[in-house]
Interface confidence: medium
């Protein structure tokens, strides 16, 4: 293919004064292949190379790659010539990275975290905005308050939760040591002593066919927050499940095709059949999301030999309802995470 | 196949804004700088800057610093070039092209009041 | 930047003649240049790259060579769909730059 100055940074380093030396010539035409494909080492793609003409072992990260010697596309690699630039002749397979994240107007650095106000921390990863709520969820005494309410505290950015009592004014839900930090404590306590936090899963990025699902975890050694994903797949974008409606009724909840069947991806298929459900739709406004569900690992086998296993969303129940939410509003589900395990994983 | 699919002409005012769209098909988005490209009619090419949607990097040729700015949108194999500040002199076809190989159609965009 | 001098801007040939367009480069670039072909309302078509590599499906009348920083784009046995404007292109140093190009005309 033809030379094209690599990545680099913004600034362009100039090339040396004086090369003498020719660009080497990495495909050759016509085509001179062996004469049977390579056997390729496990978890090591077997790819048509760059130049168009014969079957090779993709290149993996760390090594060199040529027009014609191409990085392993199934494990995110593209080939870096930023060593060699602007010559477009020789680089390095590196991993590809993430994109930065636009938020209110303000763009931000993939892997960068930041306060887009007092009540959360957020990190951009790969696209996608994850926030943390710095404001803990402490619970309401359930025993010896009849009325807890959650309510603004002047000069502090969490609320609180108060008892209202019919006798008299609101007041504070425990002392001070039973654990309602104020807002500064629990800043305090989610960085001293990292207090373990997964998010939830954000709804679906798509509301038919195959989407991503994503949620922020700080459970690892660095008490970092980083990002898992899972597909997901509401309802499939060809069947109108408008027309399986019964007669009388507004909506359908679950709806489960009769046959069992393959998940594909990318070219490669589910190792296993399954049969599942997925959520419906309603005639009026409500929206049908999913209400009972648990994350599965489903294992993928490729064309070329390459297995991969993705999580997958995998939906047991849903209901409909009317709080059909922006897609766009990020803290919609961090608002009102629901307490219920079954219904979150 | 290769293909390089670029958005339809635009007429602009001067001091606008413009955004073209490039969507790539047939090879590895992340594994390839889109480059963009103008001409003005009658006129040789001129190089605007290019984009590595694998490493997320960016360069822009010295004269369009601060007025081209270039993106992507890889869950949708798409490049895109914004020019702002457009002037009558902008007027040109605008080419993406994967690695200087494969070009688009090209994109014509009239800044004219 | 690196200024890339193309000539003739124009030339008059009938089919079957043998065509050389040259390329002068204001340092070196070592064989990084691309040769490509335009036709009116459509994008170039690269034809050579690395001075004198035949892009793949490129007939083989187009050949491209090389001495010190002077580039050479020959067609030999000029054919009805070669008359077109020709522009060669260094992808040595940022920014890219491109030749004025030369004008391939029916005589």
């Known amino acids: 293919t033809a030379l094209s100055p690599a990545p680099t940074t913004m600034d362009f380093t100039p090339a040396p004064l004086e090369d003498t030396s020719s660009r080497p010539q990495f495909c050759k035409w016509p085509c001179e292949c062996p004469p049977s494909p390579p056997r390729c080492p496990l978890g090591v793609s077997l790819i048509t190379d760059g130049c168009e003409c014969c079957k090779m072992c993709a290149q993996q990260l760390g090594d060199n790659c040529t027009e014609a010697a191409i990085c392993d596309p199934h494990r995110g690699l593209y080939c870096d010539y930023s060593g060699d630039r602007p010559r477009y002749a020789i680089g390095v397979c590196a991993q590809v990275v993430g994109v930065g994240c636009v938020l209110d107007g303000v763009r931000y650095n993939n892997g960068q975290s930041f306060q887009p106000n007092c009540k959360y921390n957020c990190t951009c990863i790969d696209g996608a905005v994850g926030c943390t709520p710095l404001c803990l969820r402490v619970r309401p005494p359930r025993l010896w308050c009849p009325h807890p309410r959650r309510v603004s505290i002047p000069g502090h950015c969490c609320e609180q939760w108060v008892c209202e009592d019919d006798a008299k004014r609101p007041r504070k839900t425990a002392p001070r040591d039973t654990g309602a930090f104020d807002a500064v404590g629990e800043v305090e306590a989610w960085h001293r002593n990292c207090i373990a936090y997964t998010s939830p899963w954000s709804p679906c990025s798509t509301s038919c066919g195959l989407g991503v699902s994503t949620r922020i975890s700080n459970v690892n050694a660095q008490c970092w927050p980083e990002q898992e994903s899972r597909l997901c797949n509401l309802r499939p974008c060809d069947v109108d499940i408008h027309t399986l409606i019964k007669a009388g009724k507004k909506c359908l909840a679950v709806y489960q095709p009769e046959a069992s069947m393959n998940f594909t991806l990318a070219g490669c298929i589910s190792t296993r059949s399954y049969q599942p459900k997925y959520c419906g739709v309603c005639m009026d406004n409500r929206c049908c999301i999913p209400y009972k569900s648990k994350t599965i690992d489903v294992s993928f086998q490729c064309p070329d030999g390459l297995g991969f296993s993705r999580q997958v969303l995998w939906i047991n129940a849903c209901f409909c309802n009317l709080s059909c939410r922006n897609p766009n509003d990020i803290f919609a589900d961090l608002e009102s995470y629901p307490d219920f395990s079954e219904i979150a994983n | 196949e290769v293909q390089l699919v670029q958005s339809g002409a635009e007429v602009k005012k001067p001091g606008a804004s413009v955004k073209v769209s490039c969507k790539a098909s047939?090879?590895?988005?992340?594994?390839?700088?889109i480059n963009w490209v103008r001409q003005a009619t009658g006129q040789g090419p001129e190089w605007l800057g290019w984009l590595n949607p694998g490493s997320g990097k960016t360069g822009n040729a010295q004269n369009f610093q601060g007025r081209v700015f270039m993106t992507w949108d890889t869950s949708k194999d798409t490049a895109y070039m914004e020019m702002s500040s457009l002037r009558s002199d902008d007027t040109a076809v605008y080419y993406c092209a994967r690695n200087l190989d494969y070009w688009g159609q090209g994109t014509l965009v009239t800044v004219s009041s | 930047d690196i200024v890339m001098t193309q000539t003739p801007s124009s030339l008059s040939a009938s089919v079957g003649d043998r065509v050389t367009i040259t390329c002068r480069a204001s340092q070196s670039i070592s064989s990084y240049l691309n040769w490509y072909q335009q036709k009116p309302g459509k994008a170039p078509k690269l034809l050579i790259y690395?001075?004198?590599s035949l892009q793949s499906g490129v007939p083989s009348r187009f050949s491209g060579s090389r001495s010190g920083t002077d580039f050479t784009l020959t067609i030999t046995n000029v054919q009805p769909e070669d008359f077109a404007t020709y522009y060669c292109?260094?992808?040595?140093?940022?920014?890219?730059?491109f030749g004025q190009g030369t004008k391939v005309e029916i005589k």
């Open positions: 292109l260094q992808a040595y140093d940022f920014p890219i730059t």
């Open positions: 690395a001075a004198s």
């Open positions: 047939g090879y590895t988005f992340t594994s390839y700088d």
